[in-house]
C-alpha cells in the first residue's frame, strides 16, 4: 500500500466518509500511522 503523506490523507478521508465521520477526533492524517489502516 502507498504510505506517502498524500495517500495516507486520501485513505483517511475515504475511511471517514464510509464511517459517516463517526471516529475519534484525533484520528487525523498527521497522527495516524499507515498501520492504522
Amino acid at each position: 500500500a502507498c504510505d506517502t503523506a498524500t495517500c495516507v490523507t486520501h485513505r483517511l478521508a475515504g475511511l471517514l466518509s464510509r464511517s459517516g465521520g463517526v471516529v475519534k477526533n484525533n484520528f487525523v492524517p498527521t497522527n495516524v500511522g499507515s498501520k492504522a489502516f
Epitope: 502507498c2 506517502t4 498524500t6 495517500c7 486520501h10 487525523v28 492524517p29 498527521t30 497522527n31
Partner: antibody
C-alpha cells in the same frame, strides 16, 4: 475560510539562503501535512518535500536534501522552507500546499513566493 | 524517481470540443495520480485525485481515468475559462513528480 498566505518576493545573491513562510488559517494546522513545491520559469512543477507539523517529521526530495530545511512554528500555525547555497537555477516561484479533509476535502495552495537569485 | 510524461505539450481546441490530455508514468503508480489546472500567474488548482475523483466544486465536464502507468484527463466540452496549463502528478512514491504540463488554448 482556509488560507495559506506566503511571504513576499525575495531577491538573493548566489550562495545566500532564503526562508519562505506560509501562514495557515481556517483549519487545525497540526492535523495535516504541508508540502512545498517550486516552479522555475518554463519548467515543470518540482516537489521539494513535506513536513508533518504534528511531530515535525520531514521527507525531502533527494535533489534538495541538505539544502532545503522544512520547519514549523505550531503556535503561529506557520510553516517555513529555507533553501541554502542558492544558485541561479533556484530562481522560481515557491508554493506551500496542504491536502485537507476538514473543513473541506480539498488540496489548498498558497499564492506563491517568487525567489530571484541574481548577482 | 518516477518520470511523468504528458502529451501533448500544447494544444488548441474550439469551445465545445472534447479535449483529452494523457500522462504516462515510468512505472506502476496504481491510481495515485492527481491533476491540476494552472492559470497564468496563479497557483495550481486541484481538479482530480486518485486518478478519477473530482474535488468538490470542480465542474463535471472534467473527468479523469486510468491506472498503473496510463492516465487521462478529459474535458467533455471545452469552455473559454478552461484556458490554462494542466499538470499531472504522481504521489505513490517519494519524491512526488509532475508532468511537464499541457498548455491548452482556444482556437
Amino acid at each position: 475560510e482556509v488560507q495559506l498566505v506566503q511571504s513576499g518576493a525575495e531577491v538573493k545573491k548566489p550562495g545566500a539562503s532564503v526562508k519562505v513562510s506560509c501562514k495557515a488559517s481556517g483549519y487545525t494546522f497540526t492535523d495535516y501535512y504541508m508540502n512545498w513545491v517550486r516552479q522555475a520559469p518554463g519548467q515543470r512543477l518540482e516537489w521539494i518535500g513535506v513536513i508533518n507539523p504534528y511531530n515535525v517529521r520531514t521527507t525531502y526530495n533527494r535533489k534538495f536534501k541538505g539544502r532545503a530545511t522544512l520547519t514549523v512554528d505550531k503556535s503561529a500555525s506557520t510553516a517555513y522552507m529555507e533553501l541554502s547555497s542558492l544558485r541561479s537555477e533556484d530562481t522560481a516561484v515557491y508554493y506551500c500546499a496542504s491536502l485537507l479533509i476538514r473543513p473541506h476535502y480539498f488540496d489548498y495552495w498558497g499564492q506563491g513566493t517568487t525567489v530571484t537569485v541574481s548577482s | 524517481d518516477i518520470q511523468m510524461t504528458q502529451s501533448p505539450s500544447s494544444l488548441s481546441a474550439s469551445v465545445g470540443d472534447r479535449v483529452t490530455i494523457t500522462c504516462k508514468a515510468s512505472q506502476n503508480v496504481g491510481t495515485n495520480v492527481a491533476w491540476y489546472q494552472q492559470k497564468p500567474g496563479k497557483s495550481p488548482k486541484a481538479l482530480i485525485y486518485s486518478a478519477s475523483y473530482r474535488y468538490s466544486g470542480v465542474p463535471s465536464r472534467f473527468s479523469g481515468s486510468g491506472s498503473g502507468t496510463d492516465f487521462t484527463l478529459t474535458i467533455s466540452s471545452l469552455q473559454p475559462e478552461d484556458v490554462a496549463t494542466y499538470h499531472c502528478q504522481q504521489y505513490n512514491f517519494y519524491p512526488y513528480t509532475f508532468g511537464q504540463g499541457t498548455k491548452l488554448e482556444i482556437k
